[in-house]
């Protein structure tokens, strides 16, 4: 699987999940999030050569097309597969609120 | 929506579905498909600027991060959203078989 266990331990040029730390205040200009101060959002990048981790029948066909026709510009793209939530603490006035934001952390990637 | 109705009628540089006709014999080397001879598989391509058809909270956050930090290399990617099946006719020996292949035709795209 193109997941953090594999991708963070290997120098992989092709489609893989990459570490990306986002500081809410510095990177997004968000003052409203009290905790955490930031988090590893991660992201997916890298080419999708030769039928790598194809997601659907279309990406299989497109990968095959691209493999057999290397001059073609139509190739699958490396995007998130498994995502996990992030729990944040913020305030509405003086009232603390705990919110679980879905699909915030990329754990693995696929070629789609 | 970044679908064929919009994308095929407009010169859109950003993420959109693009027409791609695949000839089974010439492009894939498939002799086994009797009908059709090929089909419009289409594909997704184009940049994903901030908030363009963002797919998840992560792609929204990543799009914002990319907008505020233009030097960053982490940006969402344009990939299929809605896919449709394709019905094919082939033979097993002399017996004709009709098969509906799922997720073969891209109808719209998203930034993921």
């Amino acid at each position: 699987a193109l997941d953090t266990n594999y991708c963070f331990r290997n120098l992989e040029e092709n489609c893989c999940v990459r570490p990306l730390y986002i500081d809410f205040r510095q990177d997004l200009g968000w003052k409203w999030v009290h905790e955490p101060k930031g988090y590893y959002a991660n992201f997916c990048s890298g080419p999708c050569p030769y039928l790598r981790s194809a997601d659907t029948t279309h990406s299989t066909v497109l990968g095959l097309y691209n493999t057999l026709n290397p001059e073609a510009s139509a190739s699958p793209c490396c995007v998130p597969q498994d995502l996990e939530p992030l729990t944040i603490l913020y305030y509405v006035g003086r009232t603390p609120k705990v919110e679980q934001l879905s699909n915030m952390v990329v754990k693995s990637c696929k070629c789609s | 929506a970044l679908d064929t109705n919009y994308c095929f009628r407009n010169l859109e540089e950003n993420c959109c579905v693009r027409p791609l006709y695949i000839d089974f014999r010439q492009d894939l080397g498939w002799k086994w498909v009797h009908e059709p001879k090929g089909y419009y598989a289409n594909f997704c391509s184009g940049p994903c600027p901030y908030l363009r058809s963002a797919d998840t909270t992560h792609s929204t956050v990543l799009g914002l991060y990319n907008t505020l930090n233009p030097e960053a290399s982490a940006s969402p990617c344009c990939v299929p959203q809605d896919l449709e099946p394709l019905t094919i006719l082939y033979y097993v020996g002399r017996t004709p078989k009709v098969e509906q292949l799922s997720n073969m035709v891209v109808k719209s795209c998203k930034c993921s």
């Epitope: 066909v61 095959l64 057999l68 | 894939l28 080397g29 002799k31 086994w32 097993v92 078989k97 799922s102």
Partner: nanobody, 114 residues
Framework: QVQLVESGGGLVQPGGSLRLSCAAS????????MGWFRQAPGKQREMVAI??????SYVDSVKGRFTISRDNAKNTLALQMNSLKPEDTAVYFC?????????WGPGTQVTVSS
Amino acid sequence: QVQLVESGGGLVQPGGSLRLSCAASGSIFGVFYMGWFRQAPGKQREMVAISTDDRTSYVDSVKGRFTISRDNAKNTLALQMNSLKPEDTAVYFCNLNQLGTDYWGPGTQVTVSS
């Protein structure tokens, strides 16, 4: 259901040759492609060569050294590997994609070492 079994792996010296074979059994129809993939320790599985009815493709690192061939009548796939290098060491897997579904063999070990 499709079953695949590879054979022909082994230990060979650099510059040597091996021929891998893959026997497919079951109901073989609607083949998108058949191919050889390999996986070195700690690495992702990667394509080596694929074959459709009348097209073939090779990963750059094996072009001119490896040749893939299919015998549809016997439902077999072969990979002739010449001028082998230590970096070709891996487990080699036969793969058949039928109507979009992947089937894999258990793999055969190829070790290139002096």
